[in-house]
Interface confidence: low
């Protein structure tokens, strides 16, 4: 029975050219985390394997940094980075848990005035 829950940083807005941390946390389960995948829509960004450590997809290695913890740091953000990000926790014996984060990257002039993305 899957009893765990994923907490995420929710909906984030960030400034073009800046950096952001994507963070998920699995709680309420004693299941062992064997691997965490980070994906953007249908693209694999990174894998953190309990035994093998981190692997960053080659197409993202210049802008993605592992951590903090099981999170992911995105650097040199562009407007094209706007979209859904998923943390996929592979656990034993529970199975797979998925968390969702929505990132909107704002042009500098917009971000400086404090606008941020919200889902109605």
């Amino acid at each position: 029975m899957m009893t765990g829950t994923i907490e995420t940083t929710g909906n984030i807005s960030a400034e073009k050219g800046g950096s952001i941390i994507l963070q998920c946390h699995l709680s309420s389960t004693t299941a062992q985390v064997t691997q965490v995948n980070w994906e953007q829509q249908d693209q694999l960004l990174a894998i953190c394997n309990a035994d093998l450590g981190w692997h960053i997809s080659p197409s993202f290695k210049d802008r993605v940094a592992p951590g903090p913890g099981l999170g992911l740091t995105l650097q040199s953000l562009t407007v094209n980075d706007t979209g859904e990000y998923f943390c996929i926790y592979h656990t034993y014996p529970d199975g797979t848990y998925t968390g969702r984060i929505f990132l909107e990257v704002l042009e500098s002039s917009v971000a400086e005035h404090g606008a941020r993305f919200q889902i109605p």
Partner: nanobody, 119 residues
């Protein structure tokens, strides 16, 4: 308007210590994640440490055991205590925060403070 102002940088010998401060105006540090990034000459800006509103702390592997991040809610200031400094710690250190209490780091930046580790 939210502003982050760093201070405490300077020249220090290898093995020495420094404490960086990040004063936040227009917001309370207790309700937002705060963090530090750094950028060495010719390199990308990299994550150093973060502290969440619940007090959880995160560190880059390269600084674990040497750097400590903390926050003083009464002074609305975050700190980075840096011990056992190495020449490779030389960089401009930036304080980072967020627009909302639910977001990650890095959409509000300070102007940076230079740390130089050299004998």
């Amino acid at each position: 308007e939210v502003q982050l102002v760093e201070s405490g940088g300077g020249l220090v010998q290898p093995g020495g210590s420094l404490r960086l401060s990040c004063a936040a105006s227009g917001r309370t540090v207790s309700s937002h994640a705060m963090g530090w990034f750094r950028q060495a000459p010719g390199k990308e800006r990299e994550f150093v440490a973060a502290i969440t509103s619940s007090g959880s702390t995160y560190y880059a592997d390269s600084v674990k055991g040497r750097f400590t991040i903390s926050a003083d809610n009464s002074k609305n200031t975050a700190y980075l205590q840096m011990n056992s400094l190495k020449p490779e710690d030389t960089a401009v250190y930036y304080c980072a925060s967020s627009y909302s209490s639910s977001s990650g780091l890095g959409d509000i930046w300070g102007q940076g403070t230079l740390v130089t580790v050299s004998s």
